[in-house]
């Protein structure tokens, strides 16, 4: 595999990670796929410092992150442990609200206008943030 030592064009470096901030909206799954095709993942927030960095760049706009509970428990897309990790939910969130009338509950997490987190319907077209770590060998599978 090859090692990424600097961030791609149009990405922002911060604390040995690269971040890319969309300026348009997609459903959570489509945003997730977009990041994967960039050899990245939806942003995983592991500290208050990283929260403030992301919040500064996205402004007061609903923005997807790499956290969901579509299969039951809350999970970060990169495998970071949810239970012991950083959290910044709004009061009384997540609430898996069913009252939106769109069917089902709320299984995907996003930054709200004040930066704190809320769970929402995964189909909503929110902006998103991709993240990839520097100095991490990219997975290049062997050819068949």
């Amino acid at each position: 595999g090859s090692e990424r030592t600097c961030c791609p064009v149009n990405w922002v470096e911060h604390e040995r990670s690269c971040y890319w901030f969309s300026r348009s909206g997609k459903a959570w799954a489509d945003a997730d796929n977009y990041c994967r095709l960039e050899d990245a993942h939806l942003v995983v927030v592991t500290s208050w410092e990283e929260q403030k960095f992301v919040q500064h760049h996205i402004g007061p706009v609903n923005t997807w992150m790499g956290l969901h509970d579509q299969n039951g428990p809350w999970k970060w897309v990169d495998g970071t442990d949810y239970e012991t990790g950083f959290k910044n939910w709004r009061p009384e969130q997540p609430d898996d609200w069913y009252g939106h009338g769109l069917g089902g509950g709320e299984d995907c997490a996003h930054f709200t206008d004040d930066g704190r987190w809320n769970d929402d319907v995964c189909q909503r077209p929110y902006r998103w943030v991709c993240e990839t770590e520097l100095d991490k060998a990219s997975q290049e599978p062997p050819l068949l």
Epitope: S24, Y34, L37, S138, E140, P141
Partner: antibody, heavy 122, light 108 residues
Amino acid sequence: EVQLLESGGGLVQPGGSLRLSCAASGFTFSSYAMSWVRQAPGKGLEWVSVISGSGGNTFYGDSVKGRFTISRDNSKNTLYLQMNSLRAEDTAIYYCAKRETYDWGSDAFDIWGQGTMVTVSS
Amino acid sequence: DIQMTQSPSSLSASVGDRVNITCRASHSISNYLNWYQQKAGKAPNLLIYTTLNLQSGVPSRFSGSGSGTDFTLTISSLQPEDFATYYCQQSYSSPPWTFGQGTKVEIK
């Protein structure tokens, strides 16, 4: 000059296999996701598969999932499509295409190869 | 998957005519819409990306518009080299990218 050149097409019997190649030049191959798109004779365009720049992430259209495998060798600037369990309905021109992304989060296939014909027939 | 429907499927026009091709998405795709031109026996060629942005080298007689589910490709003054098949493609829900069935522009 940015260029994509496919090869490996031909006539194959139903149930058979074929491996297509796409040689890239004129751009930093490993920095771009690459895709295969096909076109059956006299028909429209159908997206087949895509692979991220490192090769670590792959996606497939429903009609080929489980039968086709996309891969790449960045040291050779080459994209591959391994096609197994071929069916008559896989008969098409297969194009490789470079995926370009734009500032705000959209993408498009901005460079296409000339295509290679795959015919599945007994 | 999001379905893309183009109309008309074919049209006849003369050099100098203004031509409109429409594309409708089965769900809102914001402005994640691309247009391609394909000449007989050739590979497709990107014309317009993200609804209205002209790909480098594409003549200014081509333009795109629309938002949500309804989009239009306009050729302001048809030229001989514009006789081809045109495809729209959504990149909102991608993968899978999906294309319209194509619109063939023929000489009247």
